[in-house]
Interface confidence: medium
C-alpha cells in the first residue's frame, strides 16, 4: 500500500524556494520584483527602522500559531461535573447581604475525587445558568485567594436575554492550583463591574440556584442548573502511558533540527534572498529561516489482528484519521519585510512565511 | 511534473472509517472494543445524559480551532505608526487631575491617512511604553465611547519590572469603528482596575510620554516612546483585487458540500458506528459526521515567463508555498461520547475528529 | 486491616546516604497520596514530602528539596524515600502515612516509624 | 517557629472538658484548608482524630470534637479521661509556604 522512493533533497528545496518567490510576490501583489532605479542612496531612514523594528517585536511576543498541542490532548479526556456546595452551608453565612457579588464555594475533595493528579486536568470550566434579564451588565470572575482577599480572573458584558442562558468561564489554572494544594473550601465571586467613578455598584444578574431573591424556591430548583465545574481530564490509567517511551514527540526545530528523524519532521533551510532568489529589492531582513516540511506519515491498516501493536503509531503518524496522512506545517509565523516602491520605503508584514514545526495531518 | 490519476472515492471513504476505527480506540487507549456484557439495561441515567449534554453545548459554543483565516490576511500588510496627539493639545486639560486614569487621544484623520478604507484594516495595536515599577497593579483599558462615558475594552495584571517595557493592547474593532465615523478626535482612557471593595484607586503605572509627574521633560522624551497605534492594513491598490473572481474560497462544508469543486475540498462523509464499524459500544450518539479532505492542490512553478497568470493561484493552491501542497484539515471540532466500561458509564471528549473546512498546506 | 511499615532507617554519617521504604497493605495502594512525617527526638512533628497517587506529582519541605527524592511503585504497593546528604539536623523518627482521600493531606494510617540517626 | 501556633502543654482533671486551640492565619486555616487533629500516646505513632475541621475519624470516640472559625481551629475533649494523656498536634496546608504542610507545635496535655 505503500509505494517508497527516494526524496531527492535538492530537489525539494529548490521547489520550495522557487514556491517562496512566487508566494513573496503574489503576497505582494506584485507581477514582477519592483524596479530599483529610484531608490534613495544610504542606510535605511530611522523612522522606517524603528517601524520594522517594532513590527519584528511583536513577532518575537506573540507567534502567530497557537503551540502545538501536547501529547495528552490527543488522548480521550473523562468528563464530570463538580456540584458548588450547597448553599445552606455555612460558609455562605457572610457572604449573604453583599449586592455585587454572588459567591460559589467548592469542596476541592470533590474535585479531587474526579481528578486525582493536577497535570491530568486538560480543562475546568465554572458554568452558571443567568436567568432572563432586562439589564446589560459588566461583570467580573474572581477567586478566592486568602481569607479577605479575592484574585481577578475574567470578566464579561451580559447583554439582555430573554431566555436563561449558560455563561462558561475557562477555570483551568485555577482548579489545577487548587489540586496542587491540599483539599479543603475553595470559591469564585460573580460580581458588578465597579469603574473608578461609577455609582451603581450593584449586581443585577441572577445566577439559577444562588441568587439571593430567588433564595425560597431553592428546593425546586433542578440541582442540574446550579453552578458546577465541568472537568475534563485524562483517567489516571491512562495517564500511566503518557510517560512512557513511545510518547509523540513535537516535530518542532528543536527536535528536528538536532536528530536523524526519518519521519515526517521540519527541515532546515535558510533564504538568502540576494543569492537564493537573485534579489535585491528586499533591504530588511537579508534573508530568512523558511524552513519546510518533509518525511513520510505512514497510513496505518487497523485491522483487528494488529490492533495492540498499531494503536499507539497513531497519535504520532495520522492523529487526524486521515486516509492519506501528509506532512505539513503546524505551527508557522510571520515575517516583516522592508522594501521600495520607487523613493518609498515601505514596511510590510507577510503572514506564515516560517514553518516552525510540523505535524502528519 | 504532475501525474494524475483517477481517485477512486469509495477506496478513501474505505480507509477513512479504517482509520476511524483506530483513532478512536486509540484516543481511549483501548487494544479492543469494550465488553458490553455488563451494562445495565434501559435508557442511560438521567445525570450521564446531562453531563453528555453539557459537553455538547460546550462545543456548540466554541469551535476547537481558530476560524480559517480571510483572503485578506494571505496578502501582505502595510505597517504604518500614528503618535497620540502631543500632551500641551487643550483636549488634555480636563483629565489633568484624575488620579485612576490617564488619557491618549488621537486624530483620526491620522489614521485615515494611513488606512483609507475600514474593511483595509487588518489589525491595530495601541502601543505603550510603561517605565520601570515596584509595584503590582491591575490596570483596565476604556474607550472613548461619547462626551463623558467610556467603554471597557480590557485588562492587564502588570508586575514589577526593573526596565521600560512596551504593553500592547488590539484595538482593531474600535480603530475600524473610528474609520466608520467622521473625522475627529478619539481616545483611550487606561485606568487602575477599582474593585467594588477597594480602597485605593490611583493608577501607579506611569507611561512614557503621557504620565502627569514626567510633563516637564516631554521635550526630551524622543518620539519613538510616546503612545501609538501600530496599524497593519492592506494597501488600497492592492484591495481592488480581493473581489476579483479569482479569490480564494472557505474550502468548509457550507462550499464545499454545495459545489462540484474538483480541487481540495472538505467532503461529506457521516460514520454510523453501527454499520460502518459495527460498533455497539458507543450509546451516545450514534454517530457523527467526520468529513475528510480530498482533491489536488497544483504546485506551481512560478518561472519568469508566467508570473501574472500563476501567482493569483498561489493564494487559493499553494499559500504556504510547500514543495508539495497537500489537501488536508483546516478546523476541526472535538466529539463527546457516552460509553460503558463494565457497569459505570463514562462520557469522554474525544479532540480533532469532525473535519469543518480544509486548506492546501 | 490497613498496615503501613516502614524499614531502611540506621545510622550514618553526614553526607551519607540512605533509603527508607514503607510497605503497604490492606487498601488499594495506588488510589491513595502517601506523605513521609519526621519527628526529632523530643520534638514535634514535621512534614517531609508527598507523593501523588500515580506518582506524577512530588513536593518536598524547603528543609529536605534537592536532596531526599520520594518514588512508589504501585505494583510492589511500597514507597520509597531516597536521601543523600544527610545532616545532623535530618536525624529522627520517620514515618510513612496514608492520605484519607486521594490526596487531601490527612493522615488516616501510620506506620511505626524508623530511626534514622545521623551522626559522625 | 511553628506557623500553627498551639499551648506547649494543659491540664485537666476526669470528667472535666478542655479545649484546645490551634492559631493560624488565612493562608491555612482562613484559606478554607482542611484542619486535622491528631493524638500521639507516648512511645506510638500519631494517630487521626478529626479530620476536616470537624470530623471524626472512624473509631474515634464522640468525646473528640473540632470546630474551626475564622483562622482559629478547637479541638475540644469532654469527660476527660486518663487515656486521653497525649501530645496533641493540629495539622492543615498552607498555601504560603513552598513546603506545603504544616503542623502546630503540639499540646502536652496532662490528666491530673
Known amino acids: 500500500l505503500s509505494t517508497c522512493k527516494t526524496i531527492d533533497m535538492e530537489l525539494v528545496k529548490r521547489k520550495r524556494i522557487e514556491a517562496i518567490r512566487g508566494q513573496i510576490l503574489s503576497k505582494l501583489r506584485l507581477a514582477s520584483p519592483p524596479s530599483q532605479g529610484e531608490v534613495p542612496p544610504g542606510p535605511l531612514p530611522e523612522a522606517v527602522l524603528a517601524l520594522y523594528n517594532s513590527t519584528r517585536d511583536r513577532v518575537a511576543g506573540e507567534s502567530a500559531d497557537p503551540e502545538p498541542e501536547p501529547e495528552a490532548d490527543y488522548y480521550a479526556k473523562e468528563v464530570t461535573r463538580v456540584l458548588m456546595v450547597d448553599r445552606n452551608n455555612a460558609i455562605y453565612e457572610k457572604t449573604k447581604d453583599i449586592s455585587h457579588s454572588i459567591y460559589m464555594f467548592f469542596n476541592t475533595s470533590d474535585i479531587r475525587e474526579a481528578v486525582p493528579e493536577p497535570p491530568l486536568l486538560s480543562r475546568a470550566e465554572l458554568r452558571l445558568q443567568r436567568l432572563k434579564s432586562s439589564v446589560e451588565q459588566h461583570v467580573e470572575l474572581y477567586q478566592k485567594y486568602s481569607n479577605n482577599s479575592w484574585r481577578y480572573l475574567g470578566n464579561r458584558l451580559l447583554t439582555p436575554t430573554d431566555t436563561p442562558e449558560w455563561l462558561s468561564f475557562d477555570v483551568t489554572a485555577v482548579v489545577r492550583q487548587w489540586l496542587n494544594q491540599g483539599d479543603g473550601i475553595q470559591g469564585f465571586r460573580f460580581s458588578a463591574h465597579c469603574s473608578c467613578d461609577s455609582k451603581d455598584n450593584k449586581l443585577h444578574v441572577e445566577i439559577n440556584g444562588i441568587s439571593p431573591k430567588r433564595r425560597g424556591d431553592l428546593g425546586t430548583i433542578h440541582d442540574m442548573n446550579r453552578p458546577f465545574l465541568l472537568l475534563m481530564a485524562t483517567p489516571l490509567e491512562r495517564a500511566q502511558h503518557l510517560h512512557s517511551s513511545r510518547h509523540r514527540r513535537a516535530l518542532d526545530t528543536n527536535y528536528c533540527f538536532s536528530s536523524t528523524e526519518k519521519n515526517c519532521c521540519v527541515r532546515q533551510l535558510y533564504i538568502d534572498f540576494r543569492k537564493d532568489l537573485g534579489w535585491k529589492w528586499i533591504h530588511e531582513p537579508k534573508g530568512y529561516h523558511a524552513n519546510f516540511c518533509l518525511g513520510p506519515c505512514p497510513y496505518i491498516w487497523s485491522l483487528d489482528t494488529q490492533y495492540s501493536k498499531v494503536l499507539a503509531l497513531y497519535n504520532q503518524h495520522n492523529p487526524g484519521a486521515s486516509a492519506s496522512p501528509c506532512c505539513v506545517p503546524q505551527a508557522l509565523e510571520p515575517l516583516p519585510i522592508v522594501y521600495y516602491v520607487g523613493r518609498k520605503p515601505k514596511v510590510e508584514q507577510l503572514s506564515n512565511m516560517i514553518v516552525r514545526s510540523c505535524k502528519c495531518s | 511534473l504532475s501525474t494524475c490519476k483517477t481517485i477512486d472515492m469509495e477506496l478513501v471513504k474505505r480507509k477513512r472509517i479504517e482509520a476511524i476505527r483506530g483513532q478512536i480506540l486509540s484516543k481511549l487507549r483501548l487494544a479492543s472494543p469494550p465488553s458490553q456484557g455488563e451494562v445495565p439495561p434501559g435508557p442511560l441515567p438521567e445525570a450521564v445524559l446531562a453531563l453528555y449534554n453539557s459537553t455538547r453545548d460546550r462545543v456548540a459554543g466554541e469551535s476547537a480551532d481558530p476560524e480559517p483565516e480571510p483572503e485578506a490576511d494571505y496578502y501582505a500588510k502595510e505597517v504604518t505608526r500614528v503618535l497620540m496627539v502631543d500632551r500641551n493639545n487643550a483636549i488634555y486639560e480636563k483629565t489633568k487631575d484624575i488620579s485612576h486614569s490617564i488619557y491618549m487621544f488621537f486624530n483620526t484623520s491620522d489614521i485615515r491617512e494611513a488606512v483609507p478604507e475600514p474593511p483595509l484594516l487588518s489589525r491595530a495595536e495601541l502601543r505603550l511604553q510603561r517605565l520601570k515599577s515596584s509595584v503590582e497593579q491591575h490596570v483596565e483599558l476604556y474607550q472613548k465611547y461619547s462626551n463623558n462615558s467610556w467603554r471597557y475594552l480590557g485588562n492587564r495584571l502588570l508586575t514589577p519590572t526593573d526596565t521600560p517595557e512596551w504593553l500592547s493592547f488590539d484595538v482593531t474593532a474600535v480603530v475600524r469603528q473610528w474609520l466608520n465615523q467622521g473625522d475627529g478626535i478619539q481616545g483611550f482612557r487606561f485606568s487602575a482596575h477599582c474593585s467594588c471593595d477597594s480602597k485605593d484607586n490611583k493608577l501607579h503605572v506611569e507611561i512614557n510620554g503621557i504620565s502627569p509627574k514626567r510633563r516637564g521633560d516631554l521635550g526630551t522624551i524622543h518620539d519613538m516612546n510616546r503612545p501609538f497605534l501600530l496599524l497593519m492594513a492592506t494597501p488600497l491598490e492592492r484591495a481592488q483585487h480581493l473581489h476579483s473572481s479569482r479569490h480564494r474560497r472557505a474550502l468548509d462544508t457550507n462550499y464545499c458540500f454545495s459545489s462540484t469543486e474538483k480541487n481540495c475540498c472538505v467532503r461529506q462523509l457521516y460514520i454510523d458506528f453501527r454499520k460502518d464499524l459495527g460498533w455497539k459500544w458507543i450509546h451516545e450518539p450514534k454517530g457523527y459526521h467526520a468529513n475528510f479532505c480530498l482533491g489536488p492542490c497544483p504546485y506551481i512553478w512560478s518561472l519568469d515567463t508566467q508570473y501574472s497568470k500563476v501567482l493569483a493561484l498561489y493564494n487559493q493552491h499553494n499559500p504556504g508555498a510547500s514543495a508539495s501542497p497537500c489537501c488536508v484539515p483546516q478546523a476541526l471540532e472535538p466529539l463527546p461520547i457516552v460509553y460503558y466500561v463494565g457497569r459505570k458509564p463514562k462520557v469522554e471528549q474525544l479532540s480533532n475528529m469532525i473535519v469543518r473546512s480544509c486548506k492546501c498546506s | 486491616e490497613v498496615q503501613l511499615v516502614e524499614s531502611g532507617g540506621g545510622l550514618v554519617q553526614p553526607g551519607g546516604s540512605l533509603r527508607l521504604s514503607c510497605a503497604a497493605s490492606g487498601f488499594t495502594f495506588s488510589n491513595y497520596g502517601v506523605h513521609w512525617v519526621r519527628q526529632a527526638p523530643g520534638k514535634g512533628l514535621e512534614w517531609v514530602s508527598h507523593i501523588s497517587a500515580a506518582g506524577i506529582s512530588r513536593y518536598y519541605a524547603d528543609a529536605v528539596k534537592g536532596r531526599f527524592t520520594m518514588s512508589r511503585d504501585n505494583g510492589k504497593n511500597t514507597l520509597y524515600l531516597q536521601m543523600n546528604g544527610l545532616k545532623s539536623e535530618d536525624t529522627a523518627v520517620y514515618y510513612c502515612?496514608?492520605?484519607?482521600?486521594?490526596?487531601?493531606?490527612?493522615?488516616?494510617?501510620w506506620g511505626q516509624g524508623t530511626q534514622v540517626t545521623v551522626s559522625s | 517557629l511553628p506557623v500553627l501556633t498551639q499551648l506547649s502543654s494543659m491540664s485537666g482533671s476526669p470528667g472535666q472538658t478542655v479545649t484546645i486551640t490551634c492559631t493560624g492565619s488565612s493562608s491555612n486555616i482562613g484559606g478554607g484548608y482542611y484542619l486535622s487533629w491528631y493524638q500521639q500516646l507516648p512511645g506510638t505513632a500519631p494517630k487521626l482524630l478529626i479530620y476536616n475541621a470537624n470530623n471524626r475519624a472512624s473509631g474515634v470516640p464522640n468525646r473528640f470534637s473540632g470546630s474551626k472559625s475564622g483562622n482559629l481551629a478547637s479541638l475540644t475533649i469532654t469527660g476527660l479521661q486518663a487515656e486521653d494523656e497525649a501530645d496533641y498536634y493540629c495539622g492543615c496546608y498552607d498555601s504560603s509556604l513552598s513546603t506545603g504542610y504544616v503542623f502546630g507545635g503540639g499540646t502536652k496535655l496532662t490528666v491530673l
Open positions: 502515612a496514608k492520605d484519607r482521600i486521594r490526596s487531601s493531606y490527612e493522615y488516616d494510617s
